[in-house]
C-alpha cells in the first residue's frame, strides 16, 4: 500500500526574468527514493538519480539549476514558462509519487507565493 | 568506485594565494555537486561552499565569499579552490566531497594548508 | 542561516551500550540531514543520509530517524571501532551547516 505523500510549492507566481525554486518532499513512507523527475507537462526537465546524479534536459540546460535538495531552480523566467510542472518520486518498494506545482509569471512586480498544499 | 583525490599539503605565505585540487573518478563528474569543507585543528567542519561542474553553477557560505573561488574543469574531471589574502585563520585541512541527496556523500583525503611567515 | 544544535558535545558509554546522538534544525529541513563519523587525522565517513538511508559499507548498528526539525543518530550495540566525533550536516538550502559535533569515547 502506497502512504506516501507529497507536498509541493503549491501554485506560485513569480517575475519575468527572474528565478523560482520549485520544491517536492515526500513524507510519511519508508521506501526508498531511487530516482525524481521534474517535467514541465510532457516535457522532461531533469532527472536526479541515485546512482547516476543530475541529469538536465539539453534544452534547458542554460536556465535549470539543479537543486536546492531535490528541488530543480528555473532561471531567466519568460511568460512561456507559465504552467504546470510535476515531480515524479520513483521509490522501491511504493513505486511512483507525483506533485503539480502551478507556476504563473508574471510581467509586473506583484508576483506572490501561493499556500502550500499535499496529493497523497 | 567513486574516488576524490586531493592536492598535497601547502605551506604558504600570509597575503598569497593557493589553489588547491581534487580530481574525481568513478564517476561522471559533470552530474554531482562538488563541496568544500573546512576543518583548522580541534575544530568541527564547516562547509565553503560548492559547485556543479555541469553547468557551474555555485554555493558560497556567505562568511567564504571573497576569500574562495570555487571552479571545474570537464576536461580533467578536477575541481578547485582557491583561497586569498590569506592569514592564519586559513590555516586547516580542506576537504572535497561529492554530494549527493540520494546516496550520501564521497569523501576526498583533505588537503593540509599552513599559512606561516 | 538553518542552525544545526547537536547534543551531546561529548559522551561517555560502554561498550554494548545504546548510544542516540540528536540533531536539531532551526527550522524544517524535510528529510535533508546526513550523519557522518569522522575519525583523528581522517576525512569524514557517511553513515547516513537523507536522515534514515544507511550508507554502502555501514554496519546495521548504526541508524537514523527524524524529519523537519528534530533527528536522531542511534547506535544499538556500541563496539570499539565505535569511538570517534560524529556530526550531522543539513544539505536541503545554501548554505549548509553542520552541527558542533560528538565525541563518543568509551568508558
Known amino acids: 500500500m502506497m502512504t506516501g505523500t507529497i507536498e509541493t510549492t503549491g501554485n506560485i507566481s513569480a517575475e519575468k526574468g527572474g528565478s523560482i525554486i520549485l520544491q517536492c518532499h515526500l513524507s510519511s513512507t519508508t521506501a526508498q527514493v531511487t530516482q525524481v523527475n521534474w517535467e514541465q507537462q510532457d516535457q522532461l526537465l531533469a532527472i536526479c538519480n541515485a546512482d547516476l546524479g543530475w541529469h538536465i534536459s539539453p534544452s534547458f540546460k542554460d536556465r535549470v539549476a539543479p537543486g536546492p535538495g531535490l528541488g530543480l531552480t528555473l532561471q531567466s523566467l519568460t511568460v512561456n514558462d507559465t504552467g504546470e510542472y510535476f515531480c515524479i518520486y520513483h521509490t522501491y518498494p511504493d513505486g511512483t509519487y507525483t506533485g503539480r506545482i502551478f507556476l504563473e509569471v508574471l510581467e509586473s512586480s506583484v508576483a506572490e507565493h501561493g499556500a502550500r498544499f499535499q496529493i497523497p | 568506485q567513486v574516488q576524490l583525490q586531493q592536492s598535497g599539503a601547502e605551506l604558504v605565505r600570509p597575503g598569497t594565494s593557493v589553489k588547491i585540487s581534487c580530481k574525481a573518478s568513478g564517476y561522471t563528474f559533470t552530474n554531482f555537486w562538488l563541496g568544500w569543507v573546512k576543518q583548522r585543528p580541534g575544530h568541527g567542519l564547516e562547509w565553503i561552499g560548492d559547485i556543479f561542474p555541469g553547468g557551474g553553477h555555485t554555493n558560497y557560505n556567505e562568511k567564504f565569499k571573497g576569500k574562495a573561488t570555487l571552479t571545474a574543469d570537464t576536461a580533467s574531471s578536477t575541481a578547485y579552490m582557491q583561497l586569498s589574502s590569506l592569514t592564519s585563520e586559513d590555516s586547516a585541512v580542506y576537504f572535497c566531497?561529492?554530494?549527493?541527496?540520494?546516496?550520501?556523500?564521497?569523501w576526498g583525503q583533505g588537503t593540509l594548508v599552513t599559512v606561516s611567515a | 542561516d538553518i542552525k544545526m544544535t547537536q547534543s551531546p558535545s561529548s559522551m561517555y558509554a560502554s561498550l554494548g551500550e545504546r548510544v542516540t546522538i540528536t540533531c536539531k534544525a532551526s527550522q524544517d529541513i524535510k528529510s535533508y540531514l546526513s550523519w557522518y563519523q569522522q575519525k583523528p587525522w581522517k576525512s569524514p565517513k557517511t553513515l547516513i543520509f537523507?536522515?534514515?538511508r544507511l550508507a554502502d559499507g555501514v554496519p546495521s548498528r548504526f541508524s537514523g530517524s527524524g524529519s523537519g526539525q528534530d533527528f536522531s543518530l542511534t547506535i544499538s550495540s556500541l563496539e570499539s571501532d565505535d569511538t570517534a566525533t560524529y556530526y550531522c550536516?543539513?544539505?536541503?538550502?545554501?548554505?549548509?551547516?553542520f552541527g558542533g559535533g560528538t565525541k563518543l569515547e568509551i568508558k
Open positions: 550536516l543539513h544539505h536541503g538550502e545554501s548554505p549548509y551547516t
Open positions: 537523507y536522515a534514515t
Open positions: 566531497s561529492r554530494s549527493t541527496i540520494l546516496t550520501g556523500a564521497y
